[in-house]
Amino acid sequence: QNASRGRRQRRMHPNVSQGCQGGCATCSDYNGCLSCKPRLFFVLERIGMKQIGVCLSSCPSGYYGTRYPDINKCTKCKVDCDTCFNKNFCTKCKSGFYLHLGKCLDSCPEGLEANNHTMECVSIVHCEASEWSPWSPCMKKGKTCGFKRGTETRVRDILQHPSAKGNLCPPTSETRTCIVQRKKCSKGERGKKGRERKRKKLNKEERKETSSSSDSKGLESSIETPDQQENKERQQQQKRRARDKQQKSVSVSTVH
């Protein structure tokens, strides 16, 4: 219908040549390609003040191709879009814009956040943690016998790490002091003789439950192991002994 009329007019034009190059079906010296060979797309390129017709096998970046009965035409995507299927659906936005539902936005809508790698608006993902595990057995130095005071621990897993704007992860482990079951260690389990007898009774503060604090994104929080607690107590004992010695030597020196 319109196609044949357009072709007839072109053929009668004095500058129209049939001996064209680069995929043109018809062309002119001044305007380049006027129509294309089958399946090729027609696009107008601006060169200075002139618009030159070019025939391409696929449309350039920022354009999409539509096949009409009379012409296969490259049409510009929207200004903020780099690659599109058609005017409604952008598939890649220009720099500084985020893709959301086929549109390019300079900032993401409420409830969504920008992914700066894919340059898309994505749902905010909050941290998800599993239920706590049961408390571990009450232990001291890896043993469940021979001591009054030990520690027990429980843990949980991070099931879903949060996105940039998501809620932070809670602690992934908790430790608290506990009373070890009163039973003698078998020979293989025994610790250093008499150490436990010398130990002072638990302070009220020491009996309190201790909870580890979380880091910002739910990485395993640091907790005091039974070994570390044992070392601390040993150091405190040594300090007390040193203090006692000092007091003795001071009193002696004053006699002289």
């Epitope: 219908q1 319109n2 999409y64 539509t66 096949r67 009409y68 009965p69 009379d70 299927f85 058609n86 005017k87 409604n88 659906f89």
Partner: antibody, heavy 116, light 107 residues
């Protein structure tokens, strides 16, 4: 939000005329090629006609060529389908849609019944 | 005109089933194929374009594949809201044509 609302359908005798309208809102109407697609009762979808964004070119399916005319008024954001010499086989729900390779947005349709 | 033939014309399935609908073109249409879903009394809704590109908001259980003349729409695990009629459409050539449709019913 894109909205397309068709009107003008009804019951008409064979050989008579009918004019369908489609009011568009929620998008830049003058940027988009528009089409009419119809669906006979209990049948599939059939493209009828397309008009390009500026109204300068129109395309029709063979069975309606010379009888139907698609037009648009970009100042009123409205698409039209003038249907002359209607036949029983033109009985269908007529949808207007944006046509950019695919038919992305559709109206709710208007029923045209051609019957004596 | 390019003919699109869908098979089957109708299909009974249950919730949770994996379903495949095929669309065969009478000539090479490259990857210029779309799929639509239509529910009774409603306008069709575009699901997929360029054979396998999902429209935003369409669940990922829908997928498309194929090229040239043979194409498929797959629903990996049917949900109650998926029971509808599905159409393929080619836009490689005018007139743009649709398949005759595949009606997906509850078994």
């Amino acid at each position: 939000e894109v909205q397309l609302v068709e009107s003008g359908g009804g019951v008409v005798q064979p050989g008579r005329s009918l004019r369908l309208s489609c009011a568009a809102s929620g998008f830049t109407f003058s940027d988009y090629d528009m089409a009419w697609v119809r669906q006979a009762p209990g049948k599939g979808l059939e493209w009828v006609a397309t008009i390009i964004y500026d109204g300068s070119r129109t395309y029709y399916r063979d069975s309606v060529k010379g009888r139907f005319t698609i037009s648009r008024d970009n100042s009123k954001n409205t698409l039209y389908l003038q249907m002359n010499s209607l036949r029983a086989e033109d009985t269908a729900v007529y949808y207007c849609a944006t046509h950019d390779k695919t038919f992305d947005y559709w109206g709710q349709g208007t029923m045209v019944t051609v019957s004596s | 005109d390019i003919q699109l033939t869908q098979s089957p014309s109708s299909l009974s399935a249950s919730v949770g089933d994996r379903v495949t609908i095929t669309c065969r073109a009478s000539e090479d249409i490259y990857s210029d194929l779309a799929w639509y879903q239509q529910k009774p009394g409603k306008a069709p809704k575009l699901l997929i374009y360029d054979v396998n590109s999902l429209i935003h908001g369409v669940p990922s259980r829908f997928s498309g594949s194929g090229s040239g003349t043979d194409f498929t729409l797959t629903i990996s695990s049917l949900q109650p809201e998926d029971f509808a009629t599905y159409y393929c459409q080619q836009y490689d050539n005018y007139p743009n044509t649709f398949g005759q449709g595949t009606k997906l019913e509850i078994k």
